[in-house]
């Protein structure tokens, strides 16, 4: 008996076609993605092909003015249209907090949304009951197939759940889960969901009766072949994971932003076991054409964004890298660009003494979610800068001691080369690493502009001096494994929209050209 | 638990036809392969064909399309192998098999 | 048709040996491969499929891999019952076909 799972993972917000990096779609004839496209290759394969299943791992929320708008409405209206089967909550399904996920998507899905290991406590308990599962038996044609939810144990750290949601271990909630479907006579089990590849593979490892895993949260792309376009595979499609209990079991995911539709064909025997597999991402191209009923519901929501997001803000006359292949490995000029954003926004209190209270800025890489290619005119908008920073977070004023502050340095790289968010870029800071050096003792030069002069320079960080520094809320509240921020800053004021600050820099300075200029070495 | 469950063994006459049984359980009949394979003492195993229980489609080995005629019942998940003509060169065990699982085998003694 | 020739026809060992059987594919059949045990009393028990997932029940000694178009099944400790006919089959596509098979004797 054969399956086909389409899937996706880590849309943000990408209901509209893109460019090929995922930013602003330009010239429409060479752009990607988007529901309208999605819907007709899933109806072209529902079509054709007996046993389907269109599956989400997560994270459709946050990414574009979409969600900036809509909060997770436009979410639950256009799954809806294209008949998703079920979808496990990412981490981002929180960020405007339960009662953000709540009202506009659990209560308006009519899909189940799925996670294993998220369990509700106190008065949440009974308020979230059933509107969220940790599984759910799909009928398949005569067949059956359970598909069972997780999501990152680390989403306290990266989002807005709240006190009374308690995150476990995936593994150690996933089992009794599968255990209880197998009592169920279902032996066709999907695990689907939201902790990334290094996760997904531990679970089609260790969790017993697991037959394939569908992933997220890490944008892993894996092809076997030759790739369709720029990103490069992490492995071949699926990735084959042998389980302690012997068995082949393929772990997919589709890498983000609506770019692909992953296609995973997997073949059972009588007995449930996956006899083959085989399938790869398919690329959303302009050679597939977009469904125009959902194209015109599109075109029907986007009115109400376009006051909000159209006007011209300022030009670059530059490409402003934010994509995660430079932003999250070293210094990208959209990182000097906001950080330089934030210092500018700051510029007050200057005395004889000072030239300005604060000349530091970090943040997280990961917090850098899009580039904007400077080939449409140059122009910058809001709903561009709402791409590259869709959080809606602040950028807030810290005081820290020079030993918190290199120990965050420490933890920017701690772990290097693995695409995590939680590299730091920065400005009024020259920072050198040296990665041959085991993690905690990387940072080998740490030069700080100073504030008390009147000709800044760069002088060593000193251990026990009191410094401010402008950052995100989210890095203040420790967010991305930052806990010596959270746990060491001497104060703590929380500051203007990070999107405002930034297009209030664009407008002010007319015309920008930001450059990768030696801050990060 | 998978099952495929055939008939006891044969003794019939050269020239004469017979009609194995191989009933399933533990799974949906109607959506898996049920193939058939011969096995002489000595010579290994041959497959003769196959049967999609679900639209009746049936393909046969060259060396058997004249000899081998399948058939399946949906109603008790049963599938049938008929043998025709039969020569001692039929003598065998016959399996029925799934992916997972095989038939215990039927022997068929072809003999005067 | 694919041609599946199994290696050796016979093999003789000792309780605890290590043995392995062999598969060459005359053409491509992926992982689509199955290791069959047939015991005395002729039943057919499935140990092996889509060329390395072992089998509910089946004993963790049992193991199958492949090399390009040679697959193997490997028995790492011999035990008592292991003593008996082995075959391999492709299921990549139709016909079914399977190695000659491998009886196993105790040295």
């Known amino acids: 008996w054969e399956l086909t799972i389409l899937h996706t993972n880590d849309v943000h917000s990408r209901l509209e076609q893109t460019s090929e990096d995922s930013s602003k779609c330009v010239n429409a004839s060479r752009c990607m993605g988007g529901v309208a496209r999605l819907f007709t290759k899933v109806q072209q394969i529902r079509r054709a092909e007996p046993n389907v299943l269109l599956l989400d791992a997560g994270d459709q929320y946050q990414g574009t003015i979409w969600f900036t708008v809509y909060k997770g409405a436009e979410v639950a209206h256009f799954m809806n249209a294209l008949r998703y089967d079920a979808m496990a909550l990412g981490n981002h399904e929180f960020d405007n907090g339960v009662e953000g996920l709540i009202e506009p998507l659990l209560k308006e899905a009519k899909f189940p949304i799925l996670s294993a290991n998220i369990k509700a406590k106190g008065p949440l308990a009974s308020q979230i009951s059933g509107l969220y599962l940790p599984y759910k038996v799909l009928p398949v044609g005569d067949e059956v197939v359970g598909i069972v939810g997780y999501t990152s144990k680390e989403t306290p750290f990266l989002s807005n759940p709240g006190t009374n949601l308690v995150f476990e271990d995936e593994i150690t909630a996933l089992q009794p889960e599968v255990d209880k479907l197998k009592t169920l006579n279902v032996n066709k089990i999907i695990a689907l969901g939201h902790s990334g590849f290094e996760t997904d593979k531990l679970i089609a490892q260790k969790v017993r009766g697991v037959d394939v895993v569908v992933g997220g949260h890490s944008n892993t792309f894996l092809y076997t072949g030759n790739p369709p376009s720029k990103e490069v595979p992490a492995g071949k499609y699926p990735f084959i994971v042998t389980s302690d209990d012997g068995r082949k079991v393929p772990v997919v995911q589709a890498y983000a932003f609506g770019k692909y539709l992953g296609y995973l064909k997997i073949e059972f025997d009588e007995r449930g076991n996956v006899i083959s597999s085989h399938g790869n991402p398919i690329l959303l191209n302009s050679s597939i054409p977009e469904d125009p009923s959902i194209k015109a519901d599109i075109n029907k929501w986007r009115i109400k964004l376009d006051n909000y997001s159209t006007q011209e803000l300022g030009k670059t006359i530059v490409y402003l890298d934010g994509s995660s292949q430079s932003c999250r490995f070293r210094e990208c000029n959209m990182g000097n660009l906001i950080c330089d954003a934030m210092i500018n926004n700051n510029l007050r209190h200057a005395d004889e003494m000072f030239w300005n209270h604060v000349s530091m800025c970090i943040l997280n890489g990961g917090g850098i979610r899009s580039p904007i290619d400077e080939r449409n005119n140059g122009t910058i908008t809001w709903e561009n800068l709402a791409a590259v920073l869709p959080f809606g977070g602040t950028f807030d004023l810290v005081q820290l001691k020079g030993s918190t502050l290199k120990k965050a340095f420490e933890h920017s790289v701690h772990r290097y080369g693995q695409s995590t968010g939680e590299f730091l870029q920065v400005g009024g800071i020259h920072v050198v690493y040296d990665l041959s050096r085991k993690p905690g003792d990387r940072v080998v030069k740490l030069d700080v502009l100073c504030t008390k002069c009147r000709v800044p320079s760069y002088d060593p960080l000193k251990m026990d001096e009191i410094y401010k520094v402008i950052l995100p809320n989210f890095l203040a509240n420790g967010g991305d494994g930052f806990q010596m921020i959270k746990d060491e800053l001497l104060r703590h004021d929380s500051g203007d929209q990070d999107i405002n600050v930034v297009s209030t820099y664009i407008s002010k300075m007319k015309v920008i050209y930001p450059a990768v200029e030696g801050r990060i070495k | 638990q998978v099952q495929l469950q055939q008939s006891g063994p044969e003794l019939v006459k050269p020239g004469a036809s017979v009609k194995i049984s191989c009933k399933a359980s533990g799974y949906i009949f109607t959506n898996y392969y049920i193939h058939w394979v011969k096995q002489r003492p000595g010579q290994g195993l041959e497959w003769i064909g196959w049967?999609?229980?679900?639209?009746?489609?049936?393909k046969y080995s060259e060396k058997f399309k004249d000899k081998a005629t399948l058939t399946a019942d949906t109603s008790s998940s049963t599938a049938y192998m008929q043998l025709s003509s039969l020569t001692s060169e039929d003598s065998a065990v016959y399996f029925c098999?799934?992916?997972?699982?095989w038939g215990q085998g039927t022997t068929l003694t072809v003999s005067s | 048709d694919i041609q599946m020739t199994q290696s050796p026809s016979s093999l003789s060992a000792s309780l605890g040996e290590r043995v392995s059987l062999t598969c060459r594919a005359s053409?491509?059949?992926?992982?689509?491969l199955i290791w069959l045990q047939q015991e005395p009393a002729g039943t057919f028990k499935r140990l092996i499929y889509?060329?390395?997932s072992l089998d509910s029940g089946v004993p963790k000694r049992f193991s199958g891999s492949r090399s390009g178009s040679d697959y193997s099944l490997t028995i790492s400790s011999l035990e008592s019952e292991d003593f008996v006919d082995y075959y391999c089959l492709q299921y990549a596509s139709s016909p079914w076909t399977f190695g000659g098979g491998t009886k196993l004797e105790i040295k």
């Open positions: 098999a799934g992916l997972s699982d």
């Open positions: 053409q491509d059949i992926g992982d689509r």
């Open positions: 049967i999609f229980p679900g639209s009746g489609n049936t």
């Open positions: 889509a060329t390395s």
